[in-house]
């Protein structure tokens, strides 16, 4: 029997200080570049080595960025999202959604003494 894959979704506020070479990550997504089907959100596609985001350590590839300095990233063109980051200033506050994959055991089978349930 196959296990099912669930996702644990958490949100986090990440405050980054722009480094000498910027914030140090790449993004995909936008209304004109849907990365996830039926979702025009903005996602992190790359964390640059030794960049501000990498040194902070909290932002991860695959994270969805919900807002920048309180500004919602919904329904933005890709380039408009890029420009928003580039013009965000020295101290940048990101509201981020992490999506962690959780592998559950086979459905309907619980070992004896399993405390859950």
């Amino acid at each position: 029997m196959n296990g099912r894959v669930d996702y644990l979704v958490t949100e986090e506020e990440i405050n980054l200080t722009r480094g000498p070479s910027g914030l140090g990550f790449n993004i995909v997504g936008g209304t004109d570049q849907q990365y996830v089907s039926n979702d025009s959100g903005i996602y992190v596609s790359r964390i640059k080595e030794n960049g501000a985001a990498a040194l902070d350590g909290r932002l991860q590839e695959g994270d969805k960025i919900l807002s920048v300095n309180g500004q919602d990233l919904k329904n933005l063109l890709h380039q408009d999202a890029v420009d928003l980051f580039r013009n965000a200033g020295y101290a940048v506050s990101l509201r981020v959604q992490h999506r962690l994959q959780v592998q559950n055991g086979p459905i309907g089978h619980r070992g004896e003494g399993d405390p859950s349930g």
Epitope: L23, N26, I27, V28, R86
Partner: nanobody, 126 residues
């Protein structure tokens, strides 16, 4: 993991043309930023051209007006059309890619902007 495979290199006379192709794996090819670099024997790797997801293009001064970079998202392929070739264009040509757009100032000629590299294809202009 993105894989890049270059083809189309060869031996050509000065003044001639070649078209290089770089086939990429991955279902999100349309989001890739792609570049061409070259390396001649005994020299450092040199930027040639780059293309963004929206087909914005960048060229090294040495190839401007002679080379054209383009992409076909339906075929997961990026091309480098090289016209009016010169002996100094002789090098191994490499395709490079990164997923997405940097939120920082984009420097297309910086190899650190790219995560994935092909094995290269030899171009010799006699």
């Amino acid at each position: 993991q993105v894989q890049l495979v270059e083809s189309g290199g060869g031996l050509v006379q000065a003044g001639g043309s070649l078209r290089l192709s770089c086939a990429a794996s991955g279902r999100t090819f349309s989001t890739y930023t792609l570049g061409w670099f070259r390396q001649a024997p005994g020299k450092e790797r040199e930027f040639v051209a780059a293309i963004t997801w929206s087909s914005g293009t960048y060229y090294a001064d040495s190839v401007k007006g002679r080379f054209t970079i383009s992409r076909d998202n339906a075929k997961n392929t990026v091309y480098l059309q090289m016209n009016s070739l010169k002996p100094e264009d002789t090098a191994v040509y490499y395709c490079a890619a990164v997923i997405g757009s940097t939120v920082d100032t984009y420097n297309p000629g910086d190899p650190l902007e790219y995560d994935y590299w092909g094995q290269g294809t030899q171009v010799t202009v006699s």
